[in-house]
Interface confidence: low
């Protein structure tokens, strides 16, 4: 067996805390094992002896989304076991070749998923737009937390809207999941929303939502 190749291009792929570590190349005569450090700075084996080039680390990183995790991908030689039904680590007292991943701080580094405009509510001449508070994979007391529960007031939404027939757009930023505008009688409005994390330096904004338009509003006088 040749010397295992070190993994390269280690990349975190993470959206709303669903987090996968990817790397290259496809292994030939060796396997990979991923290790991730926990808050006690212990290394935990994940995706043990795999021939995949990705490893789902969600279960580990959601334990504390404000921790900066370290991970590494070990390239482990393999040989047929005596029983021929599996692979064994062959380390010979030395740690196999490994490559460190960039540090991953979920709160800062996970991408925000595409937001969804949940509903419109009319309140007199005001139109309230409600953005769905989507669930994440972060758990507390056995239940999944929403984005708002994780990020608090650090989560905002950029809401861009226009009158249905107009090309002119207006943009507002809110740090809640609701936004209201004064509306005109008989006019349709179209909305487009992006989530954002105020404290971030990079990856600040989510992809935009689908553009959603209201129906033409009936006369406020009930005609």
């Amino acid at each position: 067996a040749g010397i295992p190749e070190k993994a390269f291009n280690l990349t975190w792929i993470s959206t709303d805390f669903k987090t996968i570590l990817e790397w290259q190349p496809k292994p030939t005569n060796y396997t990979y094992t991923v290790q991730i450090s926990d808050r006690s700075r212990n290394w935990k084996n994940k995706c043990f002896s795999t021939t995949d080039t990705e490893c789902d680390l969600t279960d580990e990183i959601v334990k504390d989304v404000t921790w900066a995790y370290e991970a590494k991908v070990l390239s482990v030689p393999r040989r047929n076991s005596v029983h021929g039904d599996g692979d064994q680590l062959v380390i010979h007292g030395e740690e196999p070749p490994f490559t460190n991943a960039p540090k991953f701080l979920p709160y800062r580094d996970t991408n925000l998923g595409q937001p969804v405009i949940q509903q419109f509510e009319q309140d007199g001449r005001k139109l309230n737009v409600v953005v769905k508070d989507s669930l994440t994979l972060v758990r507390k007391n056995g239940t999944f937390l929403t984005l708002r529960q994780v990020f608090g007031k650090d989560l905002g939404y950029i809401i861009t809207y226009r009158k249905g027939s107009s090309t002119g757009k207006k943009t507002n930023i809110t740090n809640t999941n609701e936004f209201s505008i004064d509306v005109e009688e008989g006019v349709s409005y179209c909305f487009f929303v992006q989530a954002m994390i105020f404290s971030r330096k990079t990856n600040q904004n989510s992809p935009g939502s689908s553009t959603v338009c209201t129906e033409q509003w009936k006369s406020f006088l009930g005609e």
């Epitope: 608090g152 007031k153 404290s199 330096k201």
Partner: antibody
Framework: QVQLVQSGAEVKKPGESLKISCKGS???????IGWVRQMPGKGLEWMGW????????RYSPSFQGQVTISADKSISTAYLQWSSLKASDTAMYYC??????????WGQGTLVTVSS | DIELTQPPSVSVAPGQTARISCSGD??????VSWYQQKPGQAPVLVIY???NRPSGIPERFSGSNSGNTATLTISGTQAEDEADYYC?????????FGGGTKLTVL
Amino acid sequence: QVQLVQSGAEVKKPGESLKISCKGSYSFTSNWIGWVRQMPGKGLEWMGWIYPSDSMTRYSPSFQGQVTISADKSISTAYLQWSSLKASDTAMYYCARYLFGLFDNWGQGTLVTVSS
Amino acid sequence: DIELTQPPSVSVAPGQTARISCSGDNLGSYYVSWYQQKPGQAPVLVIYNDNNRPSGIPERFSGSNSGNTATLTISGTQAEDEADYYCATYDSSTDVFGGGTKLTVL
């Protein structure tokens, strides 16, 4: 305007316990509260933070096991406590509203003097 | 973890531009904030996220951050700007302050 009001100065003897407080005047539970130490004539040192909504804490390695940070969200108050003070704990202690490297509103500070 | 290094002191004549540096390995990839502390007072945030000013902070305060160095710039320095200044950032789940710089307005 956000306000954080800290408890008054304390003079203690080595070995005594102490709990100082930081009361917030805003939506307390949805913000982190950080604690910062400043020893006489020295710079600022981050000690740790708490998220009062669920009392999640994080400590600087330098202060882990030396102090305890807690909060009572029902009265919008965070606490910093020692079980056994040392002379080297003599310092000004500040609480501040906190967000990952950013302390945007500070309390007025609590001076703790430990002397036999 | 990152370490932040500041010069112990910087002097500037009134009306001139003061520049206070804060250096650390690959600091430009982190957000940096700056705090002003006058004697006997609590620190005050003057710059956050590298170059943003909180409301109430005069326009003469500005910040930049690239490479290994963040810089706090005070244009048209006034006597009231004499204070200690601290940079800070967040790395590896730990907040880090620089050692502080005493700004003297001559």
